[in-house]
């Protein structure tokens, strides 16, 4: 049997026998275009494609629509994989989304959605989520039904205000909604009573900016 040389996600890489976490090259569905992603081969059985990571504030997340579309940052540290790739990938097969969160007091929590996909750019990469479980709140901190994606230069929220400009970062803002994992990074002891921080309301409550976040996806049938 001929060895697979291109992979659409980290689950395929894991199943090929490459089971060490790290940076791998993925290929866009039905294309030869490539993208580098961090693959988490340790959490919950491995095979996770990391689509977002925050840990230290080293990367500016107040970026343009184009940058969020194409991705930015470093897969070894803080980064956004790219809306276009994630939209194409999650449009081909059913994916689950796992969001891992860390606070400044040493606690960790997660939210798991059993079906996740992004609509195409023509629909502003609207997020679709179902089936929430996990420890980071019984109510989804990403508003349901899903919102369109907004950035500082593309205002698609459900608010007469401009959520992305006020709250910082690109996100699926509602009006403006209970979360923003792409907000401004605040260090410890400066992370409370912040409206533009890294927020997951139904875990940490009002105005709390988190220490670290990871968003990762994997095929539902993995």
């Amino acid at each position: 049997k001929e060895e697979q040389t291109t992979f659409r996600d980290c689950a395929e890489i894991f199943k090929s026998g490459l089971t060490t976490s790290g940076i791998y090259t993925l290929t866009f569905p039905n294309s030869t275009e490539e993208i580098k992603a961090y693959c988490d081969m340790d959490v919950g059985g491995g095979g996770w494609t990391v689509i977002q990571h925050r840990e230290d504030g080293s990367v500016d997340f107040q970026r343009t629509w184009k940058e969020y579309k194409e991705g930015f940052g470093s897969p070894l540290g803080e980064y956004w994989l790219g809306n276009e790739f994630v939209s194409q990938l999650t449009g081909q097969h059913r994916y689950v989304l796992k969001i891992q969160l860390k606070d400044w007091e040493g606690n960790e929590a997660h939210s798991l959605y059993d079906h996740f996909y992004l609509a195409g750019e023509e629909s502003n990469y609207r997020i679709h989520l179902t089936g929430l479980t996990g420890t980071a709140g019984k109510i989804s901190s990403i508003s349901q039904p899903g919102s369109d994606f907004s950035t500082k230069d593309s205002d698609n929220d459900k608010c007469i205000c401009k959520c992305s400009q006020m709250l910082s970062g690109g996100w699926w803002f509602d009006a403006c909604g209970p979360s923003n994992l792409n907000g401004q990074y605040y260090p410890q002891k400066q992370n409370t009573n912040k409206f533009n921080g890294i927020k997951w309301y139904y875990w940490k409550g009002s105005g709390y900016s988190l220490k670290a976040t990871t968003m990762m996806i994997r095929p539902a049938d993995f």
Epitope: K162, Q165, D174, C176, P178, F195, N196, Y201, G207
Partner: nanobody, 123 residues
């Protein structure tokens, strides 16, 4: 400790005007995403009336749009609600609240609240 204190309520006639004030101590209003005015009529749920975002943008409930105006004075750390052409259905306790999160029209997302000031509009 954060304290929001409302003032300016009272008894007025239909068609009259009233200006409510909300003063903050222990925090500047600029730290909030939104400062909102909510109202609660007897036997009814608390509802959003008007709000002002950190950016200065404003929002109004359909029932008050065109009659009420929200503004703020950063130097005085005070938010105002100018209420014109008052109607009997505007009778309620009016609350000032500050929010860091969530959808602006949902009371549950607001963290800090005042004690309220009563507005009664009689015919």
């Amino acid at each position: 400790e954060v304290q929001l204190v409302e003032s300016g309520g009272g008894l007025v006639q239909v068609g009259d005007s009233l200006r409510l004030s909300c003063a903050a101590s222990g925090r500047t209003f600029s730290t909030y995403l939104m400062v909102g005015w909510f109202r609660q009529a007897p036997g009814k749920e608390r509802e959003f009336a008007a709000g002002i975002w950190s950016s200065g943008d404003t929002a109004y409930a359909d029932s008050v749009r065109g009659r009420f105006t929200i503004s703020r004075d950063n130097a005085k750390n005070t938010v105002y609600l100018q209420m014109n052409s008052l109607k009997t259905e505007d009778t309620a306790v009016y609350y000032c609240a500050g929010s860091y999160d969530g959808n602006y029209y949902i009371p549950g997302f607001y963290k800090d609240w005042g004690q309220g000031t009563l507005v009664t509009v009689s015919s």
